[in-house]
């Protein structure tokens, strides 16, 4: 019962985590304009992995996609890659873990196979969570570096007369969503790995003892039935199919009354 609960909880926690990773990846607020110690502007800038947006006091929000691959910073590309790898691994992990759930019966699948699949999905969740945490952390580090660089050059004067204020960016909501989601996916993965151990009890190996009686010979092996650890050659191979294709159409409402600064 505890194993089923641990496995089920691990699955739910990972599911929430992966949903969070997807949400964070799609969010536009990875970095937001720093308002502290800056002139109050009637325009608010924020940026995501895929596009940058400007919200005016008028309520109008304008978003522009990054329509170049080669022109983007390598770090941004790396963050994108980490988040996508995290999502793909998490999605495959979810599919594997659905079949591995103890409460779901699929044909005559043995506990050993379920244990194997539980461990596989657990490892996938752990790697997925780590990818998300790494991606968000790399982006955060990039922001911190740029923040202090732009603070050092906050005002670039033209003959001391005209001032150009550089827009500084700070942590956006997506970073916190990403960290929490990555953490949840990681925790879910660990729970799945713990559940795997419970699904596959240790195999009891006793030496076979032969009792010789007069007239006929009987070989007696104690144990009645054999519990497999799930790592033997008897594990059945299941092919997992992942639809994997996901498209998202972004519709910009203009101007939205919810967009006021």
């Amino acid at each position: 019962m505890a194993v089923t609960a641990c496995q089920g909880l691990g699955f739910v926690v990972s599911l929430i985590g992966i949903a969070g990773i997807i949400a964070a990846t799609c969010m536009d607020q990875w970095s937001t304009q720093d308002l502290y110690n800056n002139p109050v502007t009637a325009v608010f800038n924020y940026q995501g992995l895929w596009r940058s947006c400007v919200r005016e006091s008028s309520g109008f929000t304008e978003c522009r996609g990054y329509f170049t691959l080669l022109g983007l910073p390598a770090m941004l590309q790396a963050v994108r890659a980490l988040m996508i790898v995290g999502i793909v691994l998490g999605a495959i992990g979810l599919l594997v873990s659905i079949f591995a759930l103890k409460c779901i019966r699929i044909g005559s699948m043995e506990d050993s196979a379920k244990a194997n699949m539980t461990l596989t999905s657990g490892i996938m969740f752990i790697v997925s969570g780590l990818c998300a945490i790494a991606g968000v952390s790399v982006f955060a580090n990039m922001l911190v570096t740029n923040f202090w660089m732009s603070t050092a050059n906050m005002y670039t004067g033209m003959g001391g007369m005209v001032q150009t204020v550089q827009t500084r960016y700070t942590f956006g909501a997506a970073l916190f969503v990403g960290w929490v989601a990555g953490g949840l996916t990681l925790i879910g993965g660990v729970m799945m790995c713990i559940a795997c151990r419970g699904l596959a009890p240790e195999e009891t190996n006793y030496k076979a003892v032969s009792y010789h009686a007069s007239g006929h010979s009987v070989a007696y092996k104690p144990g009645g039935f054999k519990a497999s650890t799930g790592f033997g050659s008897n594990t059945k191979n299941k092919k997992i199919y992942d639809g994997g294709a996901r498209t998202e159409d972004e519709v910009q409402s203009y101007p939205s009354k919810h967009d006021y600064v």
């Epitope: 009637a42 800038n45 947006c53 005016e56 009354k257």
Partner: antibody, heavy 118, light 113 residues
Framework: EVQLVQSGSELKKPGASVKVSCKAS????????INWVRQAPGQGLEWMGW????????TYAEEFKGRFVFSLDTSVSTAYLQISSLKAEDTAVYFC???????????WGQGTLVTVSS | DIVMTQSPDSLAVSLGERATINCKSS????????????LAWYQQKPGQPPKLLIY???TRESGVPDRFSGSGSGTDFTLTISSLQAEDVAVYYC?????????FGGGTKVEIK
């Protein structure tokens, strides 16, 4: 057609109060901010501040904090400017203007002349 | 506050001639997020409210004749009337829409020579 119609001219004594109205029509009132702009006789334009009809949030220019209050009645799509403790230097034409995307004032009221004289 | 300096204060131009008004901001009005300059130009005739001509420094408002054009970026901006007409006699104001408080230039009076 977007229209902002302001109340008529006012003649007030120093120390009195005045409330100027700005009725909007031709668009969804709560979707766009209403700005107030002052123009003293023979002078230029001075931005006083604005009110967000969706949230009711107000932003005032430093010079207009205190005696100047922006308010709304969304049920009749009307914005108000109230000036208390009137002074002679408050004599001006007061305009309301809609804040449209690009942070531009695309539609203006016809203006309300407030004269403060003893 | 951002100071908007307009020049000249007044301008007399012959009908059909080009009129050029300059506006200088004490800080850049270019927003890095969308590469737009938050500057608008307004025309005000006596006894009338101001009328929007140009926004985002160079985008003409619908219904505005194409003889009016705006240019410039950062801190220096220009309003050009390519061929002055009698109905263009007015005071022209530039206004920055990037920083609070929003501020207007002092105005340029355009007259016919």
């Amino acid at each position: 057609e977007v229209q902002l119609v302001q109340s008529g001219s006012e003649l007030k004594k120093p120390g009195a109060s005045v409330k100027v109205s700005c009725k909007a029509s031709g668009y969804t009132f709560t979707n766009y901010g209403i700005n107030w702009v002052r123009q003293a006789p023979g002078q230029g334009l001075e931005w006083m501040g604005w009110i967000n009809p969706y949230t009711g949030e107000t932003t005032y220019a430093e010079e207009f904090k205190g005696r100047f209050v922006f308010s709304l009645d969304t049920s009749v799509s009307t914005a108000y400017l109230q000036i208390s403790s009137l002074k002679a230097e408050d004599t001006a034409v007061y305009f309301c203007a809609r804040l449209y995307y690009g942070n531009r004032f695309d539609s203006w009221g016809q203006g309300t002349l407030v004269t403060v004289s003893s | 506050d951002i100071v908007m300096t307009q020049s000249p204060d007044s301008l007399a131009v012959s009908l059909g001639e080009r009129a050029t008004i300059n506006c200088k901001s004490s800080q850049s009005l270019l927003n890095s997020g969308n590469q737009r300059n938050y500057l608008a130009w307004y025309q005000q005739k006596p006894g009338q409210p101001p009328k929007l001509l140009i926004y985002w420094a160079s985008t003409r408002e619908s219904g505005v004749p194409d003889r009016f054009s705006g240019s410039g970026s950062g801190t220096d901006f220009t309003l050009t009337i390519s061929s002055l007409q009698a109905e263009d006699v007015a005071v022209y104001y530039c206004q920055q829409a990037y920083y609070y408080p929003l501020t207007f230039g002092g105005g340029t009076k355009v007259e016919i020579k």
